[in-house]
């Protein structure tokens, strides 16, 4: 067990705050909830402090949640792949282009460390170039999740990984919307990490409304579980 | 566990104001003003955040009632001018552990006992 891993061994608290600017739009959001890394379980509630958000809440889940996968479960024979684990409670920079087909794109800065007994994820976000009829800004997407792959590899080069994956997101005329997303996430302390071998994260999410909540809100459940490295041959033989 | 005891509460004329405060036992996170007319839900009616930054009132009291709050005495505060005969209820103060400001009251874990404020 890397000494970060230590610290999810219960339900933590997680905060979570995001300044953002698309196309001119500049918008905060506050979200908080808990994680359980046993289950690879997130429940979060997000407000837009500002008012109405300018772009779909669904756009902003792997900036959110996604951008906390130290909670991901990750089975015993693939702990020692864990690298967002073991970054803490120093925590990593997560940085991440996402680039909508056929429109703009964003571009995250998140800081992710344990401020206290709270897990805080602190993002900037700038979206640019997008259609203001388009799929985002004419909020044409469904209030929907679709489950997806997240995959892993090492960056030895930065002592940390980088991380490929596309998104569905579904609209209303029951097309989809692409979101191809180009991830790195570096360490913030100097101490030891864990670089995996090649994995991915399967992620599950259920958006919902708090029907008393008057404020532009979001409520996300997520499940996420590493997977793709198997037992090694000494396992089997046992 | 923390307590809220709010006052300030009384019979005022319509047009008229009254300043409500909600002194805290302990620190608190995020704070808000909740009210019940006889016969009705309770309902939110304004709310300050932690840092005092965010503050979010319901459609019917924007621009008549003020929130703010002073973290040093753990009190908060709920300016009402420009009272209406429909702002008759019991005035309830609740408090969160977290400093983000919801709307919803079971995201409240603490809870005055409520002040009476009538207009005729």
């Known amino acids: 067990m890397s000494k970060g891993e230590e610290l999810f061994t219960g339900v933590v608290p997680i905060l979570v705050e995001l300044d953002g600017d698309v196309n001119g739009h500049k918008f905060s959001v506050s979200g908080e909830g808990e994680g359980d890394a046993t289950y690879g379980k997130l429940t979060l509630k997000f407000i837009c402090t500002t008012g109405k958000l300018p772009v779909p809440w669904p756009t902003l889940v792997t900036t959110f949640s996604y951008g906390v996968q130290c909670f991901s479960r990750y089975p015993d024979h693939m702990k020692q792949h864990d690298f967002f684990k073991s970054a803490m409670p120093e925590g990593y920079v997560q940085e991440r282009t996402i680039f909508f087909k056929d429109d703009g794109n964003y571009k995250t800065r998140a800081e992710v460390k344990f401020e206290g007994d709270t897990l805080v994820n602190r993002i900037e976000l700038k979206g640019i170039d997008f259609k203001e009829d388009g799929n985002i800004l004419g909020h044409k997407l469904e209030y929907n999740y679709n489950s997806h792959n997240v995959y892993i590899m090492a960056d030895k080069q930065k002592n940390g990984i980088k991380v490929n994956f596309k998104i569905r997101h579904n609209i209303e005329d029951g097309s989809v919307q692409l979101a191809d997303h180009y991830q790195q996430n570096t360490p913030i302390g100097d101490g030891p990490v864990l670089l995996p071998d090649n994995h991915y994260l399967s992620t599950q999410s259920a958006l919902s409304k708090d029907p008393n909540e008057k404020r532009d809100h979001m409520v996300l459940l997520e499940f996420v579980t590493a997977a793709g490295i198997t037992h090694g041959m000494d396992e089997l033989y046992k | 566990q923390v307590q809220l005891v709010e006052s300030g509460g009384g019979l005022v004329q319509a047009g008229g104001s009254l300043r409500l405060s909600c002194a805290a036992s302990g620190p608190t996170g995020a704070m808000a003003w909740f009210r019940q007319a006889p016969g009705k839900e309770r309902e939110f009616v304004g709310g300050?955040?932690?840092?005092?930054?965010?503050?979010y009132y319901v459609d019917s009291v924007k621009g008549r009632f003020t929130i703010d709050r002073d973290n040093a005495k753990n009190t908060v505060y709920l300016q009402m001018n420009s009272l209406k005969p429909e702002d008759t209820a019991v005035y309830y103060c609740?408090?969160?552990?977290?400093?983000?400001?919801?709307?919803?009251?079971?995201?409240?874990?603490?809870w005055g006992q409520g002040t009476q404020v009538t207009v005729s």
């Open positions: 609740a408090a969160r552990r977290s400093q983000i400001l919801f709307t919803s009251r079971t995201d409240y874990e603490f």
């Open positions: 300050i955040s932690r840092s005092g930054t965010d503050t």
